[in-house]
């Protein structure tokens, strides 16, 4: 950066290098050139001259004032009219830097995602800091009030093996950088509490052609737990709104939820599941999409299924007879 | 920005004294060399004299050198040029620039380029 340029003098930042974005600031440049007297002395900021709020303070310095300075980072460097010189010559540079101290942050959440074999703590880190801003977690057995400390940039994986000091921990976040420091409130955990069931999958969907049609969604979760409670959601796709059902399942084998659906819609199904009883849910899984037929039976299956929504990305259907296609950008 | 305006301009015959002022108003703290400039009829502005705010330190063209005084009163924000034992030469439009960033060292001769705020000047008329 600028900061690794060879100095005839120096450059400084009041109140300091790293400040409060919105501040007044006042840079400094003093001049120490052999031979030269500086005849006037120039700022340059990202490299473009600046022209206003600039003044002599004597023979070897100048100030340049920023009133409301807002910019999250600048490159600055001052030079000096030497007499008898043709070009400017560099006194030095410095990167100054605007931000805010970081927000308390809340919402501290740690959950253990089935067979990841790391605890994921997350949280919210408020509103955005401009400037380089650690997090420490501090994770704290109950039993033996051990505490192991991590620091990371946003969220943190612990490994589930190095949790050692029983089930029951504290869990608290520390934010610091340049300008502040802020601690969270304290997350008390009972580690079988925290378990997430391995993620839902919906593997296909067919309309079957009964007096009233109706369409069976199949889908599975690799998960060893024995309880779990899962919603599925379903709307049509030029619908705002969802539908919910919700399911006590046992994942031994592909689950089949039945819905009786309007003909020849085009609809979204999601699912998610927790382990009965406990705090936290899977994301809703990846969108699902199935037309239903106008009278004639289909099958949608997972292999022409895309993963992202609204990608303006086709979506094949298998029908009896034809293969047809779907933009898929027409969700509501 | 600065606003300059000067004052004190006459018609004097050859030997006599006059005293210019420069008084500069707006936003004071941001000027830091002060200059008066001179135009003869005919021909170029040449440099006179300036003065530093920060210290004092003053310099002179050669052609006015033990005649010519600049000198600054911080409370008024006012320069002053005092003019001894004027020539007919010495007729022209005065005029008073400033500017933040220069610095006038004793053997600076002050240079219309450098100065970036200017006054409209007072008429000097040496003759007899």
């Known amino acids: 950066g600028i900061t690794n340029i060879n100095c005839s003098g120096h450059i400084w930042v009041e109140p300091a290098t790293i400040f409060k974005m919105g501040m007044n600031i006042s840079i400094y440049c003093q001049a120490a050139i052999k031979n030269c007297q500086p005849r006037k002395l120039h700022f340059y900021k990202n490299g473009i001259k600046e022209r206003f709020q600039i003044t002599r303070i004597n023979k070897t310095t100048a100030r340049l004032w920023y009133k409301n300075f807002l910019e999250p980072h600048a490159s600055m460097y001052c030079t000096a009219e030497c007499p008898k010189h043709f070009q400017e010559t560099l006194i030095c540079g410095k990167d100054i830097s605007s931000g805010y101290p970081p927000d308390i942050p809340d919402e501290v959440t740690c959950v253990i995602y089935e067979y990841s074999g790391n605890m994921t703590c997350t949280w919210n880190a408020g509103k955005l800091t401009y400037i380089d801003t650690k997090y420490v977690v501090h994770v704290k057995s109950l039993e033996t009030e051990e505490e192991q400390q991590y620091l990371t940039s946003s969220y943190i994986n612990i490994s589930t093996d190095s949790l050692q000091g029983g089930k029951k921990y504290l869990v608290w976040v520390q934010a610091a950088n340049a300008l502040g420091m802020e601690e969270s409130k304290q997350l008390q955990i009972h580690l079988d509490d925290i378990v997430i069931p391995s993620a839902a999958v919906i593997s296909r969907a067919e309309t079957i052609n009964a007096t009233v049609p109706k369409t069976i969604i199949y889908w599975d979760s690799q998960t060893t737990i024995e309880k779990v409670s899962c919603e599925m959601r379903y709307k049509a796709t030029t619908n705002q709104t969802w539908n919910v059902k919700e399911f006590d399942t046992n994942f031994t084998y592909v689950q089949q939820s039945e819905f009786y659906l309007e003909p020849n819609i085009k609809y979204v199904f999601q699912v998610r599941c927790q382990e009965t009883g406990k705090r936290y849910w899977q994301p809703w899984s990846s969108l699902f999409f199935h037309k239903t037929p106008e009278t004639v039976p289909q099958v949608t299956s997972k292999a022409f299924q895309h993963d992202t929504w609204n990608s303006g990305l086709t979506v094949a259907s298998i029908s009896t007879g034809h293969l047809t296609s779907d933009n898929r950008g027409d969700i509501g | 920005e600065v606003q300059l305006v000067e004052s004190g301009g006459a018609l004097v015959q050859p030997g006599e004294s006059l005293r210019l002022s420069c008084v500069v108003s707006?936003?004071?703290?941001?000027?830091?060399?002060i200059g008066w400039f001179r135009q003869a009829p005919g021909k170029g502005r040449e440099g006179v004299s300036c003065?530093?705010?920060?210290?004092?330190?003053?310099a002179y063209a050669d052609s006015v050198k033990g005649r010519f005084t600049i000198s600054r009163d911080k409370a008024k924000n006012t320069v002053y040029l005092q003019m001894n034992a004027l020539r007919p030469e010495d007729t022209a439009v005065y005029s008073c620039?400033?500017?933040?960033?220069?610095?006038?060292?004793?053997?600076?001769?002050?240079?219309?380029?450098?100065?970036?705020?200017w006054g409209r000047g007072t008429q000097v008329t040496v003759s007899s």
């Open positions: 620039a400033a500017d933040p960033m220069l610095y006038c060292d004793t053997d600076y001769e002050p240079q219309t380029t450098d100065f970036t705020s």
């Open positions: 707006g936003d004071t703290s941001t000027y830091h060399a």
């Open positions: 003065i530093n705010r920060s210290d004092g330190t003053t």
